[in-house]
């Protein structure tokens, strides 16, 4: 099976420290999903990333870096409308057992005040596999630039699998995409969090099959209400 690209899928290592809100959700020492730091106590990720307990890696672009913060988390709150059948409302808040220490390498992500339009250039990042279907996991955080795709254009590919709180992104005729292990990680556009990695076709990186993300701008009220409720 041909290796599809050599980073994320067809990306490159992120500029060091450029994604200080990026976290990794680990199961033991093993990468499970990506996520983003919303504030000192909360991480936002995908609902399909749910586990009983998480170890959250923050503060380093390198998994396994001893200088990174590692914080346990045992409480998580899925969006109540998440469906394991359609994967609509694929987002979840994870409450850290202790507060993250903010620094130049650990910062809160900016939640969106508006939904960015199709054509906007965004960056998706993660420690997910750089090859597919056979997996190759990098130790350094990878980034790839993609463009937001209109729901009309994305529906041509995914038909009724696409729900209205899902956001598509990709580059025509390109393999640039997220893959296994990137789930729940950030799609950042113009400095704000617009998407969380949700799903895509497999093997990853098939040209003209966009990545599908949870559209965060549709959920800011739920995010803020949930953090307030479970303070």
């Amino acid at each position: 099976e041909e290796a599809q690209g050599d980073k994320i899928i067809d990306g490159a290592p992120c500029a060091r420290g450029s994604h200080p809100w990026q976290v990794a959700l680990l199961s033991g020492n093993q990468l499970h999903c990506g996520g983003v730091l919303v504030n000192e106590r909360w991480v936002l990720t995908a609902a399909h990333c749910k586990m009983n307990e998480y170890t959250v890696h923050l503060g380093s672009d390198t998994l396994g870096d001893r200088r990174a913060q590692r914080i346990k988390a045992s409480k998580s709150f899925r969006h109540p409308g998440y469906s394991t059948q359609t994967h609509v409302n694929d987002l979840m808040l994870v409450k850290l057992n202790s507060q993250a220490r903010l620094s130049s390498m650990v910062k809160k992500v900016r939640l969106p005040s508006r939904c960015e339009p199709p054509g906007t250039t965004c960056t998706v990042s993660g420690w997910g596999t750089t090859t597919s279907p056979d997996v190759t996991f990098p130790s350094d955080l990878m980034c790839v630039d993609v463009k937001l795709i209109s729901p009309q254009d994305c529906t041509k590919v995914y038909k009724d699998l696409l729900e209205n709180s899902m956001l598509c992104a990709g580059i025509p005729d390109s393999k640039k995409n997220a893959c296994n292990g990137d789930s729940g990680g950030p799609l950042v556009c113009r400095g704000t969090l617009q998407g969380l990695v949700s799903w895509g076709t497999f093997p990853c990186g098939q040209p003209n099959d966009p990545g599908v993300y949870t559209q965060v701008c549709k959920f800011t009220k739920w995010i803020n209400d949930t953090m307030k409720k479970h303070r």
Epitope: Q30, Y158, N180
Partner: antibody, heavy 122, light 108 residues
Framework: QVQLVQSGAEVKKPGASVKVSCKAS????????ISWVRQAPGQGLEWMGW????????NYAQKLQGRVTMTTDTSTSTAYMELRSLRSDDTAVYYC???????????????WGQGTMVTVSS | DIQMTQSPSSLSASVGDRVTITCRAS??????LNWYQQKPGKAPKLLIY???SLQSGVPSRFSGSGSGTDFTLTISSLQPEDFATYYC??????????FGGGTKVEIK
């Protein structure tokens, strides 16, 4: 080597329960789902349901809802399928299959267990 | 639920023959169709995913085509080890997943 190894054949009486295991080896269990598929003697393949290895999320075929439970134990990389209130028409070979995909959605079954024959007879 | 209909249900062919099996979905499934081969007493084995992508290790005499509702599995030159039953499934659908009824390829 990458494989799914299932538990051995079972003979059960009508009304009883059966629990079939499926142990994964040679790959990281967590990121994948496991589906269960059964095949009655001389018949085609019937999808029974799916479970996410990490989250325990499940989807069951409607006709089996209430009788089937799928679970996983990530510490041993093992999936289980329990079928209750067995009837003679549950006599079949039961297969576990790795569901390949990324993120929330899976697309095909790229690795299968060897099958477990379950006979329901009084 | 999406229904998958395979035809023919069985066929007889000789070694070296070109064999074609079709699978029809009850509604469009784009190109998200898979083909499996099953030999007697054995587990199914993935041959083709995404309508036309050959699974690693599968001989190139197997090929798949189609999109929307109509799909084809072709064996360009039938070999003795290809006598088996072939199933399609429409992976595009959210659960439940339905398999086609199967096509048994027998020796003429």
């Amino acid at each position: 080597q990458v494989q799914l190894v299932q538990s051995g054949a079972e003979v059960k009486k009508p009304g009883a329960s059966v629990k079939v295991s499926c142990k994964a080896s040679g790959y990281t269990f967590g990121p994948y789902g496991i589906s269960w598929v059964r095949q009655a003697p001389g018949q085609g393949l019937e999808w029974m349901g799916w479970i996410s290895a990490y989250s325990g999320d499940t989807n069951y075929a409607q006709k089996l809802q209430g009788r089937v439970t799928m679970t996983t134990d990530t510490s041993t990389s093992t999936a289980y399928m329990e079928l209750r209130s067995l009837r003679s028409d549950d006599t079949a070979v039961y297969y576990c299959a790795r569901a390949a995909g990324y993120g929330a959605r899976w697309w095909y079954f790229d690795l299968w267990g060897q099958g477990t024959m379950v006979t329901v007879s009084s | 639920d999406i229904q998958m209909t395979q035809s023919p249900s069985s066929l007889s062919a000789s070694v070296g023959d070109r064999v074609t099996i079709t699978c029809r979905a009850s509604q469009s499934i784009s190109s998200y169709l898979n083909w499996y081969q099953q030999k007697p007493g054995k587990a199914p084995k993935l041959l083709i995913y995404g309508a036309s992508s050959l699974q690693s290790g599968v001989p190139s005499r197997f090929s798949g085509s189609g999109s929307g509702t109509d799909f084809t599995l072709t064996i360009s030159s039938l070999q003795p080890e290809d006598f088996a039953t072939y199933y399609c499934d429409g992976s595009y659908s959210t659960p439940p997943i339905t398999f086609g009824g199967g096509t048994k390829v027998e020796i003429k």
